[in-house]
Interface confidence: low
């Protein structure tokens, strides 16, 4: 089998075997490597000579295979723009950001650029749990059958109607979507709205 | 030559205490992100927590965040691990490894020879 | 937290098989993925990362390839020095997590 061209070598065809680690050097019209990520080029190839390498500073990175001549500055989460740092930059990624609890992302430019806070789920309603947090803003849905949620809140969650048999009480009032059952004691006198009204 | 050197392990009972210490040689210990790595018997690789250059950083998994405490003196080219209310669970090699990516780590490149700990009544 | 699966967890060669080992992560990690070599009785050995960057003295009949979620680490024509456990890691967001390990036995 042919031997596999060790970098530089001469390609008239503008393509070189290796579209990841290597580039097309056109003044020389010859095959590169390119750098490997968390490195940049410190000096460029030549006809007798591969790119030399070199390590990206602190506080930089560069994240893929690259014949660029710097590495990238690491920029922090801004909380001002409500992000929180996941994990920090290293050499061969950029900080990970995410929105900060509470918020959803407003702009996406590749990455969030802008989270604004979730709006709230009014009272009887709760937001539709999303498979990523921090995605989009809240969907308000109605409470299902037998819940009942009694607040304005971005997170707060339906929660069951009270069994007031379970309590060894019996129902005064019926829940709502908006409110609990309303248990009393059974030798309790019926409140005066409910009067005449025979409790089963 | 790099090097990383870990002592301080032993036998403890459960609940109780340990600091392990891992001495660098070698390199600028100060540039480097480090980190501890942990292994129990016949099972595989448990990454347990990682500390940045200047030890303003610190990062835990959940297994033993609030537990343990990851820690550096740069004066001394030391890495710490102090290990509080130990589980049996607990039990296993616990390696320091320094991370090639300068002060802020994601790729072990130099790793201890490892150090046993072992929690047990 | 993000986990790692790798496949086969154990497998027999010869001498000069092609070896492939599969790692796949829970959700996507780009190319943030390392492999290690460990033999028994010792510490890990950073083979590759980056997914694909060789580390600087590992033999190139060591590869690795893959980005997202799917992740590929080749042994070209397996050598004796070659039979051990391999792990591959993620490095996403913390806490990173290492796969449980693939175990490369001589048949």
């Known amino acids: 089998s042919q031997p596999q061209a060790v970098p530089p070598y001469a390609s008239e065809n503008q393509t070189c075997r290796d579209q990841e680690k290597e580039y097309y050097e056109p003044q020389h019209r010859i095959c590169c490597s390119r750098c490997p990520p968390g490195t940049y080029v410190s000096a460029k190839c030549s006809r007798i000579r591969d790119t030399v390498c070199a390590t990206c500073a602190e506080n930089s990175y560069n994240e893929h295979w690259n014949y660029l001549t710097i590495c990238q500055l690491c920029r922090p989460c801004d909380p001002v723009m409500g992000l929180e740092e996941i994990a920090p930059c290293t050499s061969k990624r950029k900080t990970q950001c995410r929105c900060q609890p509470g918020m959803f992302c407003a702009a996406w430019a590749l990455e969030c650029t802008h989270c604004e806070l979730l709006s709230d789920c009014p009272p009887g309603t709760e937001a539709e749990l999303k498979d990523e947090v921090g995605k989009g803003n809240n969907h308000c849905v109605p409470c299902k059958a037998g819940h009942f949620q009694n607040t304005s809140s971005p997170s707060a969650r339906c929660q069951p109607h009270t069994r007031c048999e379970n309590q060894g009480l019996v129902e005064a009032a019926p829940g709502t979507a908006q409110s609990d059952t309303t248990c009393k004691n059974p030798l309790e006198p019926l409140p005066p709205e409910m009067s005449g009204t025979m409790l089963m | 030559e790099v090097q990383l050197l870990e002592s301080g392990g032993g036998l403890v009972q459960p609940g109780g205490s340990l600091r392990l210490s891992c001495a660098a040689s070698g390199f600028t210990f100060s540039n480097y992100a480090m980190t501890w790595v942990r292994q129990a018997p016949g099972k595989g690789l448990e990454w347990v927590s990682e500390i940045s250059g200047s030890g303003g950083s610190t990062y835990y998994a959940d297994s033993v965040k609030g537990r343990f405490t990851i820690s550096r003196d740069n004066s001394k080219n030391t890495l710490y691990l102090q290990m509080n209310s130990l589980r049996a669970e607990d039990t296993a090699v616990y390696y320091c490894?320094?991370?090639?990516?300068?002060?802020?780590?994601?790729?072990?490149?130099?790793w201890g020879q490892g150090t046993t700990v072992t929690v047990s009544s | 937290d993000i986990q790692m699966t790798q496949s086969p967890s154990s497998l027999s060669a010869s001498i000069g098989d092609r070896v492939t080992i599969t790692c796949r992560a829970s959700q996507d990690i780009s190319n943030y993925l390392n492999w290690y070599q460990q033999k028994p009785g010792k510490a890990p050995k950073l083979l590759i990362y980056?997914?694909?960057a060789l580390q600087s003295g590992v033999p190139s009949r060591f590869s690795g390839s893959g980005s997202g979620t799917d992740f590929t680490l080749t042994i070209s024509s397996l050598q004796p020095e070659d039979f051990a456990t391999y792990y591959c890691q993620h490095y996403k967001s913390y806490p990173y997590t290492f796969g449980q390990g693939t175990k490369v036995e001589i048949r």
């Open positions: 490894a320094k991370d090639d990516d300068g002060a802020y780590g994601d790729t072990m490149d130099v």
């Open positions: 980056a997914a694909s």
